[in-house]
């Protein structure tokens, strides 16, 4: 067995990893009175736990069951905005629509948002040079798994009517590969959700096309219809001016498309 | 050692808007939230808001949403409060405020503030 | 809003003497935890606010052990064991059970 530090094709541990952590939760617990019951201290050791001293590519989500219990949270099961390839938009509007809520709104989504961890078998390092790349090196990393078991979760919660954001700036607006595609989807509960809604956000000023019109939309409508919930589709074609009017719903312009 | 200091004095005519600054030190700015709290002269305390530096999430008091914004700026450690369609009730003083942790728990006591801004709204 | 209301709102006392100033929420401030969200400030003339009590009977770093804080879920007093000349100005309760936080109005200490 070498006794050097595996290099991994992926950037290393965000620096100040477990301060971080240990913050956010502290954070998340002080502008939520509702998640004041949990601990800290304890939700760091959870966290660490799932990955210290196990080899990077052979994590499970096995290993991230005692921290998903101690950050189990409610949230309204029919307030549920899923997103894919648009993550910043999709927080500006749950920051205005605040009884809407995406994962990185919830306890273990605010945690490791933007966040790069892993650790070494046999040792109980972080490891700050690099972590496993997804493609290049190995799916079973610990962050992808941990996303993969968060995002599992939040869409099993799902109820009613849910929402996703897709970026329709993308060559596919619809991809299979992502988190939404390969998990999200396929989580969604038919006894418990009626329909999907997609909200294809358009990039440019002049795009007046029907973007639920594109054939990775009809992939995805299919995918959903053969799971027993009917799907729904609108173009934003003003990103800007829908935020705006979410805002402002009374203001004159926001009657109009946007 | 904590400390938060503020910007200094404001005059303001009605209908303006003011930008208050609060830089801090001895602490990692992203790591804690950052509220704002008005004293209006000779009346109590009223919290304003707060501020997640680290994501720019914002959290205001229903009397104050629609004319008061929060902002962070990470590079500077700066968090700053902005009023605007300002009128005479708003002149008071301004405080940032921060909480202490007590073993990893937040203590939801403002333990360190600022010196205060005082806004004053003439014509 | 919880509203925090307090008496008396103003006190004059010999130093040595003690004090106390009581608090009212109109709603339970003990969270599931087991912690309860009040705290108490002293305000002296042209300073902030300071820190003297979190969750009901704790005290902020540096506080003299001659202030304490004790109550139940809805009725708390703030205790002075003995007055000393440093402590006028103004005291103030505050829940941060939930947003948005609010303060007392205000219970205004003066020495005789």
């Known amino acids: 067995v070498p006794r050097w530090r595996q290099q991994w094709s992926g950037p290393g541990t965000t620096k100040r990893f477990p301060e971080t952590v240990l913050a956010r939760c502290v954070k998340y617990t002080e502008i939520h009175p509702e998640m004041r019951h949990v601990d800290c201290q304890s939700v760091w050791d959870a966290f660490k736990g799932a990955f210290i001293s196990k080899h990077p590519c052979n994590i499970t989500e096995e290993d991230y069951q005692p921290l998903m219990k101690l950050g189990t949270q409610t949230v309204p099961c029919n307030k549920i905005l899923l997103w894919s390839r648009i993550k910043d938009l999709a927080h500006q509007f749950t920051q205005v629509q605040r009884d809407m809520f995406t994962l990185e709104d919830t306890l273990l989504g605010y945690l490791a948002d933007d966040l790069t961890w892993c650790g070494e078998f046999n040792t109980s390092k972080i490891n700050y040079q690099s972590c496993p790349d997804w493609r290049k090196d190995c799916s079973n990393n610990p962050v992808s798994v941990f996303w993969k078991t968060v995002s599992r979760r939040f869409a099993e919660a799902a109820c009613d009517v849910v929402h996703v954001m897709l970026n329709g700036s993308r060559s596919k607006i619809f991809d299979k590969n992502s988190t939404f595609g390969s998990v999200e989807v396929h989580n969604l509960q038919p006894e418990k959700v009626q329909t999907l809604e997609a909200w294809v956000i358009h990039g440019g000023r002049e795009d007046s096309r029907d973007l639920c019109q594109d054939p990775t939309i009809k992939e995805l409508e299919s995918i959903i219809s053969k799971r027993n919930i009917q799907f729904s589709c609108k173009n934003i074609y003003r990103p800007d001016k829908f935020l705006q009017c979410v805002k402002n719903p009374e203001d004159s312009s926001c009657t109009s498309e946007i | 050692e904590v400390q938060l200091v503020q910007s200094g004095a404001e005059v303001k005519k009605p209908g303006a808007t003011v930008k208050i600054s609060c830089k801090v030190s001895g602490y990692t700015f992203t790591d804690y939230i950052m509220h704002w709290v008005q004293q209006a002269p000779g009346k109590g305390l009223e919290w304003m808001g707060w501020?997640?530096?680290?994501?720019?999430?914002?959290d205001y008091a229903e009397k104050f949403q629609g004319r008061v914004t929060i902002t962070a700026d990470t590079s500077t450690d700066t968090a700053y409060m902005e009023l605007s369609s300002l009128r005479s009730e708003d002149t008071a003083v301004y405080y940032c405020?921060?909480?202490?942790?007590?073993?990893?728990?937040?203590?939801?006591?403002?333990?360190?503030w600022g010196q205060g801004t005082l806004v004053t709204v003439s014509s | 809003d919880i509203v925090m209301t307090q008496t008396p709102l103003s006190l004059s006392v010999t130093p040595g003497q003690p004090a106390s100033i009581s608090c009212q929420s109109s709603e339970s401030l003990l969270h599931s935890n087991g912690k309860t969200y009040l705290n108490w400030y002293l305000q002296k003339p042209g300073q902030p606010p300071q820190l003297l009590i979190y969750?009901?009977?704790t005290r902020a770093a540096g506080v003299p052990d001659r202030f304490s804080g004790s109550g139940s879920g809805t009725d708390f007093t703030l205790k002075i064991s003995r007055v000393e000349a440093e402590d006028v100005g103004v005291y103030y309760c505050q829940q941060f059970l939930e947003y948005p936080p609010t303060f007392g109005q205000g219970t205004k200490l003066e020495i005789k």
């Open positions: 969750w009901m009977s």
């Open positions: 405020a921060r909480v202490a942790i007590i073993t990893t728990v937040a203590s939801g006591g403002f333990a360190y």
């Open positions: 501020i997640d530096p680290e994501y720019g999430s914002t």
